[in-house]
């Protein structure tokens, strides 16, 4: 029975040209994590395999860095990076857990204003 849950950073925004860390965390299970895939829509960005280490898709090599931990760092962000990202945890014996993160990449000034909102 799959008892685990994936916690993610949820919906996040970042500035164009900046970088962002995508993070997921698997909790409430003793299952062994054997592999974590990071996907953007239907594109495989990177895999971290417990035995084989990290492999970054060559198409994203210059803008994607492994880590920290099982997370993924996206660099030199463009507006085209806006969208859904998925962390897919392969575990033994539970099977597969999937987490979703929505990233919005904003023009610099918009991101700055968004960061200054106040609750009245």
């Amino acid at each position: 029975m799959m008892t685990g849950t994936i916690e993610t950073t949820g919906n996040i925004s970042a500035e164009k040209g900046g970088s962002i860390i995508l993070q997921c965390h698997l909790s409430s299970t003793t299952a062994q994590v054997t592999q974590v895939n990071w996907e953007q829509q239907d594109q495989l960005l990177a895999i971290c395999n417990a035995d084989l280490g990290w492999h970054i898709s060559p198409s994203f090599k210059d803008r994607v860095a492994p880590g920290p931990g099982l997370g993924l760092t996206l660099q030199s962000l463009t507006v085209n990076d806006t969208g859904e990202y998925f962390c897919i945890y392969h575990t033994y014996p539970d099977g597969t857990y999937t987490g979703r993160i929505f990233l919005e990449v904003l023009e610099s000034s918009v991101a700055e204003h968004g960061a200054r909102f106040q609750i009245p």
């Epitope: 054997t34 495989l44 395999n49 492999h55």
Partner: antibody, heavy 117, light 107 residues
Framework: DVQLQESGPGMVKPSQSLSLTCTAT?????????WHWIRHFPGKKLEWMGF???????VYNPSLKGRISITHDTSKNRFFLKLNSVTPEDTATYFC??????????WGTGTTVTVSS | DIQMTQSPASLSASVGETVTITCRTS??????LAWYQQKQGNSPQLLVH???TLAEGVPSRFSGSGSGTQFSLKISNLQPEDFGSYYC?????????FGAGTKLELK
Amino acid sequence: DVQLQESGPGMVKPSQSLSLTCTATGYSITSGYDWHWIRHFPGKKLEWMGFIRDSGSTVYNPSLKGRISITHDTSKNRFFLKLNSVTPEDTATYFCARGLFWYFDVWGTGTTVTVSS
Amino acid sequence: DIQMTQSPASLSASVGETVTITCRTSENIFSYLAWYQQKQGNSPQLLVHNTKTLAEGVPSRFSGSGSGTQFSLKISNLQPEDFGSYYCQHHYGNPLTFGAGTKLELK
């Protein structure tokens, strides 16, 4: 088009070291992908040996640990296999290959190595 | 190590027929299975990865299926160039391992 070509001696004596070179053309070995060695024994069996990343870090088949070393020379766009303390059981056709997420999308033509005194 | 059990070891078929080769793994590899074709005296060529994704330039008469521990490669409407040996390989952990191969011969 990416091409890989293995080279090295066709005959090695038992207890000596086997050294092979894989030269890549049409793609830089520092531009992503992993770079693997695989061998094909006379009886049909294929065995993955290990790989080197573009960064230079390596992963080896545990069955060969202690005997195998994979290195690269990025200035000449080539990578190397060294297998120590060979026996006749290491007689095989040796292939280098390009790895994408640990499957092999480009293979060299292969070079046959015989271990015999 | 993940053991790969490929069957049959050999197979005879005629041009135009459909054949299926199977690969069973000793543990769950999810969808991380590749298939290669090797012709006599040549290097293996990637046909399929991630169970069912055809490699570039591979004809649509090849199709892969399965998940977990049971996988298959189907070749429909066999062509003369399809005869040779076929190998499965998991791409999920260390060591990466191959099946023992299936030799497809012309009947």
